[in-house]
Amino acid sequence: TCEIVTLDRDSSQPRRTIARQTARCACRKGQIAGTTRARPACVDARIIKTKQWCDMLPCLEGEECKTLPDNSGWTCTQPGGRIKTTTVS
């Protein structure tokens, strides 16, 4: 499970109005860090192990996911045709 945590604003810069956000995720046994719906998530470790990236549903609703030919990551294709590529280090 993941929750989005809003960090305190930088008090040394009063004009700064945007707080930083980060995810805190507590994964269950058999899960490790991944991406679901373009956000940090805990996913089945076997998905990562086998590089079946699209099985963790990394793209936003309505986008099409495809694993890169060399299994190094995935692409998310928006309905308008714009493609976002993510590679896993």
């Epitope: 995720c25 507590a26 058999g30 490790i32 860090a33 805990c42 076997r46």
Partner: antibody
Framework: AVTLDESGGGLQTPGGALSLVCKAS????????MFWVRQTPGKGLEYVAE????????NYGSAVKGRATISRDNGQSTVRLQLNNLRAEDTGTYFC??????????????????????WGHGTEVIVSS | ALTQPSSVSANPGETVKITCSGG???YGWFQQKSPGSALVTVI????ERPSDIPSRFSGALSGSTNTLTITGVQADDEAVYFC???????????FGAGTTLTVL
């Protein structure tokens, strides 16, 4: 190089308590789940306890549940096992082990016994009166 | 409990296969030359091999059974091999009873 160095073993009395410490080096300690595994005479390997990378989760084997406490200090790169109400069957060699998966920042991750990639040399515990 | 054979034997240069079944998540294989002595991981996460382990050691997962293969076994490989994984409910670690490899 990854090194795990256990200490705290030795002769213990039945009903007493022991505290084992594992000092880690050579890797980002706070990113890895850690285990204690023991080998008792005439038996194979036995899962004793484990702790998540950030210390928020702990789990224990049935033989020590209710008597054991695992904890970690990520600042000192140590993991500790406290075992109370010692019994003769607790006699054996206790190993500290690391789970290979490097948990990224913001995540709390369990280790996996099948992902143990490094072991300490072990510390021998003898429970006898 | 995990199921693995209690013993296997082979001549130098032969291929040895040791199976382990009955667990969940991933499997590892741990070598021990004598009881109470140091444990060495030869395979972790089903098929990953530590950099200092010879390439003759390999692991493969099929369903819920993992197989450790030693291709071209050597006298130095004589040891007890324990498999390890999570129990079927995924709530705790579990180890096999160990397989004694004898090189004839």
């Amino acid at each position: 190089a990854v090194t795990l160095d256990e200490s705290g073993g030795g002769l213990q009395t039945p009903g007493g308590a022991l505290s084992l410490v594992c000092k880690a080096s050579g890797f980002t300690f706070s990113s890895h789940g850690m285990f204690w595994v023991r080998q008792t005479p005439g038996k194979g390997l036995e899962y004793v306890a484990e702790i998540t990378n950030d210390g928020s989760g702990t789990n224990y084997g049935s033989a020590v549940k209710g008597r054991a406490t695992i904890s970690r200090d990520n600042g000192q790169s140590t993991v500790r096992l406290q075992l109370n109400n010692l019994r003769a069957e607790d006699t054996g060699t206790y190993f500290c082990a690391r789970s290979t998966y490097e948990c990224p920042g913001g995540f709390s991750c369990w280790g996996d016994t099948g992902q143990i990639d490094a072991w300490g040399h072990g510390t021998e515990v003898i429970v006898s009166s | 409990a995990l199921t693995q054979p209690s013993s296997v034997s082979a001549n130098p240069g032969e291929t040895v296969k040791i199976t382990c079944s009955g667990g969940s998540y991933s499997y590892g294989w741990f070598q021990q030359k004598s009881p109470g002595s140091a444990l060495v991981t030869v395979i972790y996460w089903d098929d990953e091999r530590p950099s200092d382990i010879p390439s003759r050691f390999s692991g493969a997962l099929s369903g819920s059974t993992n197989t450790l293969t030693i291709t071209g076994v050597q006298a130095d490989d004589e040891a007890v091999y324990f498999c390890g994984t999570e129990d079927i409910s995924g709530t705790a670690g579990v180890f096999g009873a160990g397989t004694t490899l004898t090189v004839l």
